[in-house]
């Protein structure tokens, strides 16, 4: 997260850290007792590694009573996700067992109504991704409030040049933005999960390259079918 600040500890009990061989790799969001939603690209290079999900965490390194690391029983990338595109960049991770719920671990309701979030709406994005251009990685969860950007502006030739389909949304990125390591994390508007940070590589904090988020409402049928 660029230009953000440390989050209030455990105030986002849905927040997950998707880890590869014990290191934070991507964000994720608990959407059901045994399921975490993240980004498909996160596991592209994880073929030989051990993927786990950390729930109930604020600090990645310090002991916390609510922290627990779960093994992954099953990883289900969206069937249409591809390495070279940002489209359909969703991944569902089934935990080895149901998460122990409590004040610091709680699923987040996700948007099912397939309507665009109004431009200008302030949404919260959180993560353990890098916080500067030298790769400074935070130990504690960071967050930032970002205004939703209309699709027409985001699709300008100077911005994302038509790449933003109806299944994607954008948020402003002028010095405040999601960045490497935040991919797969939640974009929350009005207490509801609206988007998932895409993991396409791009510059962070540049106003002309807005943050791109996968709209979960557009994938409700797929999410329901996997969780069923």
């Amino acid at each position: 997260i660029l230009g953000g600040r440390e989050a209030e500890a455990h105030a986002r009990p849905y927040m997950a850290s998707v880890q590869l061989n014990g290191a934070h790799l991507c964000g994720g969001v608990l959407v059901a007792e045994q399921w975490v939603l993240s980004a498909a690209h996160c596991l592209e290079d994880a073929a030989d590694g051990k993927v786990q999900v950390l729930l109930g965490a604020h600090s990645l390194s310090q002991p916390e009573p609510s922290k627990r690391l779960y093994d992954v029983l099953r990883a289900v990338p969206h069937p249409d996700s591809q390495p070279d595109t940002i489209d359909h960049d969703l991944l569902l991770l089934q935990l080895s067992e149901k998460a122990t719920l409590g004040p610091a671990v709680r699923p987040l309701p996700w948007q099912r109504v397939d309507r665009d979030v109004a431009p200008g709406t302030l949404c919260d994005v959180a993560g353990w991704g890098i916080v500067n251009h030298a790769g400074r990685r935070p130990d504690s969860l960071q967050h930032v409030l970002l205004p939703v950007l209309d699709r027409a502006t985001c699709n300008r030739a100077t911005h994302h040049d038509g790449a933003i389909t109806e299944r994607l949304m954008c948020a402003e990125s002028n010095r405040r933005d999601s960045c490497k390591g935040d991919s797969g994390g939640p974009l929350v508007c009005g207490g509801v999960l609206e988007g998932v940070v895409t993991s396409g590589s791009r510059v962070c904090g540049n106003a002309k390259k807005p943050g791109i988020y996968t709209r979960v409402a557009s994938y409700a049928a797929w999410i329901d079918s996997v969780l069923a």
């Epitope: 290079d45 030298a134 790769g135 400074r136 990685r137």
Partner: antibody, heavy 118, light 107 residues
Framework: QVQLQQPGAELVRPGTSVKLSCKAS????????MHWVKQRPGQGLEWIGV????????NYNQKFKGKATLTVDTSSSTAYMQLSSLTSEDSAVYYC???????????WGQGTSVTVSS | EIQMTQTTSSLSASLGDRVTISCRAS??????LNWYQQKPDGTVKLLIY???RLHSGVPSRFSGSGSGTDYSLTISNLEQEDFATYFC?????????FGGGTKLEIK
Amino acid sequence: QVQLQQPGAELVRPGTSVKLSCKASGYTFTSYWMHWVKQRPGQGLEWIGVIDPSDSYTNYNQKFKGKATLTVDTSSSTAYMQLSSLTSEDSAVYYCARNGYDGSMDYWGQGTSVTVSS
Amino acid sequence: EIQMTQTTSSLSASLGDRVTISCRASQDISNYLNWYQQKPDGTVKLLIYYPSRLHSGVPSRFSGSGSGTDYSLTISNLEQEDFATYFCQQGNTLPYTFGGGTKLEIK
């Protein structure tokens, strides 16, 4: 356990270049950025720059732009720093260090001592 | 760039003593302060980051504190292996910068 292996010493001629290596083991190489730090004899430490092994993105201290070039070889989990147009001012110990939390460097190599002499 | 100043370049102490090493930044570094130990053979180890979190494997006799521009490293109950040089480093603003070091010697 995390290990960063660096050769002990390099003796080089003024005006030439040298490529220093740092072989990482005990962790997933592409998951952590790698810093390089310079220490002149009897002096403090200077941050040279950092590289992200996952995509070779670099960020340099302005002072070392044009002097140092950072690269990686992910197949061998090795980070490299090339120093060019060497002068006596470049005689120093050069460390590689893994990116830790909150701007720290959590594991360091033993350092390579570079001596520039004719 | 941010200047990091360790006013004490050397410090003498005895085994079992408690010592405090200080570090001052030329501007607020928002707690992004880290401490390193360098042994005479050149080996460097991270001790503490942000500015009171103990790195894994570091003995609990090491502790850090501070905020804004002023930070300190405290070593209680000094042991033989603690006699070394200690550097502070700010990780708030690029380029990252280090203090000049404080050499801890046996009295």
